[in-house]
Structure formats: C-alpha cells, structure tokens
C-alpha cells in the first residue's frame, strides 16, 4: 500500500489508477477507516450521507473535503478500463496535526544549586499523533534520570477533537559552581516523520549558590541502620546553625507527610520502612540543605548486622544495605 499523510481539516484526493478519465466507469472504492465497520464500498453514483465525508469525482478519484482522525485507514480502488483490464490502487492514509508552538509555563526565574528545582512546564496543544516533548540545556538534549535531571510527563486527549495536549515538567539539580545563567528550551517532535520539530522560546533562570553551611549531620540509632523486624530506628538531624532551621524528612527522595522535627522515630519496623532516608534543613536566610542519605534495612533473624557503613556528600549514599 502507498502511504499517504494528510493534514487534519485539509482536502485529500486519492487517484483511482487505470480508471477512465470520465464516465461511464467501472470502478469501486473500498474504505476501512475509523468511520466504517469493516469495509465500506463507494461507487461513482454516490449520494447519501457519505457524500459529505468522501465522494467519487467524475474522473474516478476519491475526494475527502476535510480529513479527520476517523479517516485514518485503508483506501482501495478497483477499476476496469475500456479494454477490460483491471487495475488496483491501495492507499494507507494517516492524518496529522501540527500543534501550536510549544510554551514553557510556570518557569522559574531562579534555581538553587545543589538541590532539585522545578525549571518549568512545557505545554504543547493540539497535536496528532501525540508526538513527544524534549528538553534542551544550552542547545543540547537533556536526558531524564541523568545528572539530577527528572521529567514528569502527562498526555491528555481532547474528548471532542481527539487532539493531544502534552505536558512535561522539568526538574534539575544545578551543579555548584556551574553556569550561572543556563538556557533551557523545549521542543515538540511530531509523531509522523518528515515534519520538523517546534521549539519554545528559551528561558534563562539565574542559578543561586547557597552560602556553604556547616554540614547537616544525620545520626542513626542503631548505628548502621540495620534492625530486626519490629525494632525501632531513631534518626536525628543535627544542624549547627542558629536559629534552628525547620527540618523535614525524606524517604526515597520523597518528602514524608510529617510535621517538621529534628528527630524521626521508626517504631515497629516492617518491610515497608526499608529505604533511603535523609533530612532537609530549611533556613530562613539560606536555601534548603539536605543531609547525607542513610539506608534503613531489616536484618532477618540469623543474619549478621553490618558494622557502620559509610556515605559521603549529600548524594544518595548507602548504609547497611541488607
């Protein structure tokens, strides 16, 4: 089958090869699309409600005045010329719609080095097929889940038009001492080939470097963070700064739904409590500061508990991995 791509809302003419240029003609068109159940046969005589969707022109071609998503599918024409020779035409029609220029909304004017920040949300409206959004830093593609980059994507389909709205939220952790004015942009790549990407206007947030603070210490009891089922682990976040900052807790990188406190008690430890814990100290005059991370694990009876593990920096270090 010959592949045809047509823009939604535009007219489309499909030639019926081998058909006499004018009536009388012996030809029929068969359609299997989103509008049909199995095959629909159209003849030059036409008439009826299908004429508004597709009709056979005097030269035997099939004319669709405004293609829609439901017109995607297979179109076949079988024609016989004056000498009785049969010719078949076979088309696979796919439709597309180029969305408006994507936009970055809720963009941050300032990012804090060393901690995750939301850069902004890229929105593309009115595409078909869905296509993809990708982010760029200083013109180079950003790879999610690499070097502190994370992307949350959402695809919605309009209930009436069937067109897609894409959303992509970018989170980055700028490196300390890095570029003070990075340039972020987002581009939409269509789902059908041969159409160029559409790029947003760039944004240039400032990167704020927090004044180095004395390190937040995370103390684990029992040391090493390995405990028998049903035991208790106490995590204490020690911050030398005055006045005392607010301290919140994270598990596996996600904030825990708890009021601020420098102490986190995990009583009656069960499997669901295993994971990586850290505390975040928020100072009124500085940005948030995350402690090293420790891993809490369960020692099954008969296992030897590890001695103190080691971690460095504020990345996700590990302690006592069972």
């Amino acid at each position: 089958a010959q592949n045809i791509t047509a823009r939604i809302g535009e007219p489309l003419v499909l030639k019926c090869k081998g058909a006499p240029k004018k009536p009388p003609q012996r030809l029929e068109w068969k359609l299997n699309t989103g509008r049909t159940e199995a095959w629909k046969v159209l003849s030059p005589q036409g008439g009826g409600p299908w004429d508004s969707v597709a009709r056979v022109l005097p030269n035997g071609s099939l004319f669709l005045p405004a293609v829609g998503i439901q017109d995607e599918g297979i179109f076949r024409c079988q024609a016989m010329n004056r000498n009785g020779k049969e010719t078949k035409s076979n088309y696979r029609v796919r439709v597309y719609q180029i969305p408006g220029k994507p936009e970055i909304v809720d963009s941050a004017s300032e990012l804090t080095a060393g901690v995750p920040n939301k850069v902004g949300t890229c929105v593309s409206e009115g595409s078909y097929p869905a296509g993809t959004l990708s982010w760029h830093l200083d013109g180079k593609p950003l790879v999610p889940n690499e070097k502190g980059v994370s992307v949350k994507e959402q695809t919605r389909r309009h209930p009436e038009t069937g067109l897609f709205t894409l959303q992509s939220e970018l989170m980055v952790t700028p490196a300390r001492g890095g570029d003070p004015r990075p340039t972020f942009s987002c581009s939409f790549s269509p789902g059908l080939p041969r159409h160029r990407a559409l790029r947003t206007a760039p944004i240039q947030p400032r990167v704020w470097e927090p004044v180095p603070l004395e390190e937040v210490q995370l103390v684990v009891e029992p040391e090493g963070g390995a405990v028998a089922p049903g035991g208790t682990v106490t995590l204490t976040c020690e911050v030398p700064a005055q006045p005392s900052p607010q301290i919140h807790w994270m598990k596996d990188g996600v904030p825990l739904p708890l009021p601020p406190s420098p102490v986190l008690i995990l009583p009656e430890i069960g499997p669901q409590d295993q994971g990586t814990y850290s505390c975040v100290a928020t100072h009124s005059s500085h940005g948030p500061q995350e402690s090293r991370a420790v891993s809490i694990s369960i020692i099954e009876p008969g296992e030897e508990g590890p001695t103190a593990g080691s971690v460095g920096g504020s990345g996700l270090g590990t302690l006592a991995l069972a």
């Epitope: 009021p259 406190s261 008690i265 009583p267």
Partner: antibody, heavy 117, light 110 residues
C-alpha cells in the same frame, strides 16, 4: 491493645472555646504522629493538622490556623485540640488518628461538638 | 487547593471483587501522595486500611489491597464480605504539607 480514647460530646455557646482530648494507650505515645480530622454533618473529612508528640512540632491546614491549636501532654500520653471562637460552622465530629510515617492506622471514636445558643 | 474525587456509591455481591478509586484534580496520583484508605462503619467507627498507597495497616484482612491504577489510587476488595459494607474514604498528601480527603464511597454488599 492500641486505643485512642476521645473525650465525650460537647455542647458549647457561640464565641466560646472547647478542648478535645485523645488519650493514647497500647503503644509508645511519642513514637507516633497524631492527626486531627473534622467530619461535618453529611460531609466528607477535612484534615485539621498534625502534631509530633516527641518534639511538639505541628503542621496545620491553613483553613484551621488560628481556629485550632494542637498540643500534647507526654506525661499522660494525651493529644489535645483546642477550638476557639466557635460558630455553628464548627459543629462537627472531630477525630484523632495515629499516623505511622504515612499511614493513618488507628482512629479515635470521635468527639461531637455542637455549637448552639 | 486540590480536590480528591471518589465514586459516590458502589454495589457488589459477597465473594465478588470490587475496586474503588481516588482521583486528584492536580494530575496523576503517584506514590508520593501516600494514598490512605479509611473505612467508616456506623457510629463513627473509623479504621485505617491502607497507607502509603499499598501498605496494609496492622490487623487488616488480606482481601483489602491498595495500588495505583492509571492516574488514580485504588482500593481493591477481593472476595467482598457483608461486613465490608461501609463508607470508604481516601486521603492524599500533597507536598505543600497538606492531606486532602475524598468525598467517600458508600459500598453496599448485597
């Protein structure tokens, strides 16, 4: 057996205050966070706030900031909630619930507060 | 503020499997919303069933399970029993330090 025992029903006048208590037993009181929840008649539940009994720190739903004050008495393993400047909008059943990291596992039986002149 | 939506009522038969869902107005529910499911029986009797999306509370029967289905949190009762007739509330946590409850689903077991 783990229990959260709340004080009995209260009938109070508009403008007055009321203090509801929730006595915990069967577990180490300071090891678990306490959540307070409001259930207005025929309505869903609303989170009022959360208190850490070990440290005394609180988080409030902005809607209830100034309306509710959460405290604890560690010596009696009791969490308290004071509601002030009461109006008919505050007539509801109030619950305490134990929060273990992220799970509201045990609930009190509720305290009914009726504000009426 | 976020709005959390549940089915207002569902009916099932003893032994059947039934799934209740919980949708967030802010987008897909994720594990970082720490979905909780709470059961209310007559006389204001509340019991926590599920916390943190899929962790059963102590003493809760294994027929209750929590999960994420598509962009919603879900509570599945596998082999419903007549004593499971109750109102079920879900609660989601939002990272601006906020718990929000759904309107509750009245489950009838006929």
């Amino acid at each position: 057996e783990i229990q959260l025992q709340q004080t009995g029903p209260e009938l109070v006048k508009p403008g007055a205050s009321v203090k509801i208590s929730c006595k915990a037993s069967g577990y180490s009181f300071t090891d678990y966070i306490m959540v307070w929840v409001k259930q207005s008649h025929g309505k869903s539940l609303e989170w009022i706030g959360t208190i850490n009994p070990y440290y005394g720190s609180t988080s409030y739903n902005l809607k209830f900031k100034g309306k509710a004050t959460l405290t604890v008495d560690k010596s009696s393993s009791t969490a308290n909630m004071q509601l002030n400047s009461l109006t008919s909008e505050d007539s509801a059943v109030y619950y305490c619930a134990r929060l273990r990291l992220y799970a509201m596992d045990y609930w009190g039986q509720g305290t009914s507060v009726t504000v009426s002149s | 503020q976020a709005v959390v939506t549940q089915e207002s009522a569902l009916t099932t038969s003893p032994g059947e499997t039934v799934t209740l869902t919980c949708r967030s107005s802010t987008g897909a529910v994720t594990t970082s919303n720490y979905a909780n499911w709470v059961q209310e029986k007559p006389d204001h009797l509340f019991t926590g069933l599920i916390g943190g999306t899929n962790n059963r509370a102590p003493g809760v029967p294994a027929r209750f399970s929590g999960s994420l289905i598509g962009d919603k949190a879900a509570l599945t009762i596998t082999g419903a029993q007549t004593e499971d007739e109750a109102i079920y509330f879900c609660a989601l946590w939002y990272s601006n330090h906020f718990w929000v409850f759904g309107g509750g689903t009245k489950l009838t077991v006929l």
